[in-house]
Amino acid sequence: QTSVSPSKVILPRGGSVLVTCSTSCDQPKLLGIETPLPKKELLLPGNNRKVYELSNVQEDSQPMCYSNCPDGQSTAKTFLTVYWTPERVELAPLPSWQPVGKNLTLRCQVEGGAPRANLTVVLLRGEKELKREPAVGEPAEVTTTVLVRRDHHGANFSCRTELDLRPQGLELFENTSAPYQLQTFVLPATPPQLVSPRVLEVDTQGTVVCSLDGLFPVSEAQVHLALGDQRLNPTVTYGNDSFSAKASVSVTAEDEGTQRLTCAVILGNQSQETLQTVTIYSFPAPNVILTKPEVSEGTEVTVKCEAHPRAKVTLNGVPAQPLGPRAQLLLKATPEDNGRSFSCSATLEVAGQLIHKNQTRELRVLYGPRLDERDCPGNWTWPENSQQTPMCQAWGNPLPELKCLKDGTFPLPIGESVTVTRDLEGTYLCRARSTQGEVTRKVTVNVLSPRYE
């Protein structure tokens, strides 16, 4: 009878084991072990027992002891079970950002590991078990589906293998994959709201505001604002689930034309964009041109109004004929035209909006001097000793200098309050003088003596 000890062994891969083969007869013709494993016999006294060191055990094996005794041949097997932890425990790669509401499939792959009967694969969220399955196949694959929720944001998903050899008197061997950190997000299907001027004048500033609600996590949202090819640097204000990005836009002559204003919001691996057209225009005020800003009475004056080539002008309320960017009027300058305003109003249509610009010029008409009965009466009769104010107004542009003299020396105090005396009586020559010439007018003052009764 042949026996073997131990009859069952569990050992780590590549390990060694001592196996004793024994026989019941005293003088066996043959005693040995049959195995493909490297073996080394340890010398022992006696013929009915042999000890072998079996080394570099890589896989399960069944070495067989045999003996040949006078009463016949017999064998005995020992069962070597090799254990080893998996060489690879890996979660299939996934995009780190996942939209809330999406079904996320977690796939764990396990290569190697034995004995498979004792090997379990566990999928976890944090420490919470999502799925537990025995490792089957090579590589073993375990999958589970997770409905992505907002509160999963920042959660770590991992895969763990458990090689449980506690029933065999050993321990529980665990291997864990690198964690996959889930970033969940919500980017609404509605595009961002963009508020900006539809038209903007060259060399001015405008304000652009881009906003969006219903974002999660709002702090991770990237906002890109651009006008044409110009990056705008917005100031972003965050709410609980919203943001508002405000930027100032300065435009120059280089920006003249139609530009695309874009606001793009990027969150996770998704983006939403709003596009708006902004027309940047150049529209200088119209030019009012007078032949001469200062003319003498009776001179022909041309007033011209010139504006942007696409503008339509009106001059003193009269539209250009034909309607267009130029208008003019002709007049013969009269004193009444002095200080007259010529106003040109130009209207330009920019992207459906009417833009108005005005320019005004004043005409100076040189005339006079004038002395007439209405403003400088030729006759005054005043009671002696009364208080009177001699009035004589000379007209003209420039305003004439006025002097009224009696006998070339005695002045009439124009515009001053005087006590009427006999000396005041007489005929005065009033002379109005300006760069335009001079005029004279005789003024007679009569003094009435008081009657004494």
Partner: antibody, heavy 119, light 109 residues
Amino acid sequence: QVQLQESGGGLVQPGGSLRLSCAASGFTFSSYAMSWVRQAPGKGLEWVSAISGSGGSTYYADSVKGRFTISRDNSKNTLYLQMSSLRAEDTAFYYCANSAYTGGWYDYWGHGTLVTVSS
Amino acid sequence: ASELTQDPAVSVALGQTVKITCQGDSLRTYYASWYQQRPGQAPVLVIYGENSRPSGIPDRFSGSSSGNTASLTITGAQAEDEADYYCNSRDSSGNHLRVFGGGTKLTVL
């Protein structure tokens, strides 16, 4: 569709003058800025000049300032480049291109016209 | 010297991805536009703004930017993509209205 067709290129002696034209169709000419870009044979692209849609603003590269004049006739849908005091280094293919705004990228290009300055 | 710097030449295997870059200070303020020029032809706009393609340009062309560098990426390069590529931007120095890079010759192997 948008079409830009340059003309007026040819052989000219150093110091001479030439006027290039670019006939445009397929878009609202007066709403678009226009530019001239040149390319010396076997070399890269070089921006030359630009003009706003209204014609009120013009821009020139330093290399041509004072010698070249850009203009446009919106009634004829035509862009011009008057070149004077020409030099050998002005030899190039001259392309006209349009952009939605004066300083903007070039949406469409013409096929180009060759200007050769040589004695 | 050009104010936008490009590699003179780049090659890519058929069907592979290639990135052409353009560097310049103005790219911190302005987006680059990219033009393709095949031999004997006029340039054609392929990318403008942050990453916009004109109609008719295949979606294998894409643009991106970071700091002072703009990139044109061709994902799955085709034989017909062999051409010169020029980046172009507004000139932030104010000397010129727009400025071109020196160009990159793309060879599809």
